[in-house]
C-alpha cells in the first residue's frame, strides 16, 4: 500500500522540513553590487529534516526514505526543497540607473521532501 505523505514531525515541533524566513543583507548574498535595497532583505527558504515519510513529494521520495533506512551509506535521505515558489521583484542597478526584474523562483512558497 502506498504510504501517506505525513505532516507529523516525529523529531518534535519545527524540526522537520518547513518554510523559514531568513533575514540577510545584500552583502550576505553577494548581491550588493547589482541589487538596490535600503535595508536587510527577507527570504523564505525550506529548512529541516526529512524523516520517515514526512512530506514525501512523490513515490520516488518514499522509496528513497525506505532505502536510506536500509542502506544509509549508499542512499542519502530525502532533502527539504521548495515545492513551489513566490515571485519577487528585484531593483537592479544598471549602467543608466535602475530597473525592475521579476524572478519567479526566488522565494520558496511551500516545502516538501524529495
Amino acid at each position: 500500500a502506498r504510504a501517506r505523505n505525513g505532516d507529523h514531525c516525529p523529531l518534535g515541533p519545527g524540526r522537520c522540513c518547513r518554510l523559514h524566513t531568513v533575514r540577510a543583507s545584500l552583502e550576505d548574498l553577494g548581491w550588493a553590487d547589482w541589487v538596490l535595497s535600503p535595508r536587510e532583505v527577507q527570504v523564505t527558504m525550506c529548512i529541516g529534516a526529512c524523516p520517515s515519510q514526512f512530506r514525501a513529494a512523490n513515490m520516488h521520495a518514499q522509496i528513497k526514505t525506505s532505502l536510506h533506512r536500509l542502506k544509509p551509506d549508499t542512499v542519502p535521505a530525502p532533502c527539504c526543497v521548495p515545492a513551489s515558489y513566490n515571485p519577487m521583484v528585484l531593483i537592479q542597478k544598471t549602467r543608466t540607473g535602475v530597473s525592475l526584474q521579476t524572478y519567479d523562483d526566488l522565494l520558496a512558497k511551500d516545502c516538501h521532501c524529495i
Partner: antibody
Framework: QVQLVQSGAEVKKPGSSVKVSCKAS????????VSWVRQAPGQGLEWMGG????????NYAQKFQGRVTITADESTSTAYMELSSLRSEDTAVYYC????????????????WGQGTLVTVSS | SYELTQPLSVSVALGQTARITCSGD??????VSWYQQKPGQAPVLVIY???NRPSGIPERFSGSNSGNTATLTISRAQAGDEADYYC??????????FGGGTKLTVLG
C-alpha cells in the same frame, strides 16, 4: 481576475479605534504584498504601512508607528488595518492596495486597489 | 525624509500632449510609478519603472526619469484623461512616498 473588497464606512468617536478589512479573491494571497494607503478629503495619497503574508511581519510608515496595526489572515485571504487613538484628522478614505513583493523595499507598484472605506471621526 | 514635488495643476488642449512633472533629489536613480485617480474612484497604476505600462493602459501614456525630475507624458490627450495623477517612489529606508498630486484638466 483579482479583486480587493473592503469593509463598509465607519463613524467613530475621537480616541476610539477602527478596524478595516480587505478581502482578496482571484489570486494567491500570500504571494503578494498588501499595503494600506489613506486619502483625507481633498488631499493626496499617504502610505500607512503594509504586510507580506508569507513573511508574516508588517512594516509601518514612521508617522503611524505605534498607532496602526496591520495583520493578515491567510485562511480567509483577508488583510486588516486597525488605527487607534483616532482624531478628527484621521477622517479619510482608507484603501488597501496589492503589489508584488519587492526585495528590500517590499511595498509599492500597487497594481490592484480596494474600493476604499470612508472612516469619519467626529464627536 | 524624501519628498516628491508635483505641480498642483496642469492644463492641456484636447488632442495635445500633457506633461506632468515630479521632482525629487536625484530621482533619476529611483524607480518611479505613476497613478491616475478619477473623482470618487480608487487610484490606477498607469506607469512603472520609467515607461512600463500595465495591461489595459494605452500607449499614449509614457514616462521618463533623469536627474531630479520624473515626467509622465500623455500624448493625444482625451477628455477621459482628466484626473489627479500621483508619482510614487521610496525613501532611504524603503517607505513608500507619494507626490502631492497633480490635477490634469483637458480643455476643449
Amino acid at each position: 481576475q483579482v479583486q480587493l473588497v473592503q469593509s463598509g464606512a465607519e463613524v467613530k468617536k475621537p480616541g476610539s479605534s477602527v478596524k478595516v478589512s480587505c478581502k482578496a479573491s482571484g489570486g494567491t494571497f500570500r504571494s503578494y504584498a498588501v499595503s494600506w494607503v489613506r486619502q483625507a478629503p481633498g488631499q493626496g495619497l499617504e502610505w500607512m504601512g503594509g504586510i507580506i503574508p508569507i513573511f508574516g511581519t508588517a512594516n509601518y510608515a514612521q508617522k503611524f508607528q505605534g498607532r496602526v496595526t496591520i495583520t493578515a489572515d491567510e485562511s480567509t485571504s483577508t488583510a486588516y488595518m486597525e488605527l487607534s487613538s483616532l482624531r478628527s484628522e484621521d477622517t479619510a478614505v482608507y484603501y488597501c492596495a496589492r503589489g508584488p513583493i519587492i526585495m528590500g523595499y517590499q511595498f509599492g507598484l500597487f497594481d490592484h486597489w480596494g474600493q476604499g472605506t470612508l472612516v469619519t471621526v467626529s464627536s | 525624509s524624501y519628498e516628491l514635488t508635483q505641480p498642483l495643476s496642469v492644463s492641456v488642449a484636447l488632442g495635445q500632449t500633457a506633461r506632468i512633472t515630479c521632482s525629487g533629489d536625484n530621482i533619476g536613480s529611483h524607480i518611479v510609478s505613476w497613478y491616475q485617480q478619477k473623482p470618487g474612484q480608487a487610484p490606477v497604476l498607469v506607469i512603472y519603472d520609467k515607461s512600463n505600462r500595465p495591461s489595459g493602459i494605452p500607449e499614449r501614456f509614457s514616462g521618463s526619469n533623469s536627474g531630479n525630475t520624473a515626467t509622465l507624458t500623455i500624448s493625444r490627450a482625451q477628455a477621459g484623461d482628466e484626473a489627479d495623477y500621483y508619482c510614487q517612489t521610496w525613501d532611504s529606508i524603503g517607505s513608500v512616498v507619494f507626490g502631492g498630486g497633480t490635477k490634469l484638466t483637458v480643455l476643449g
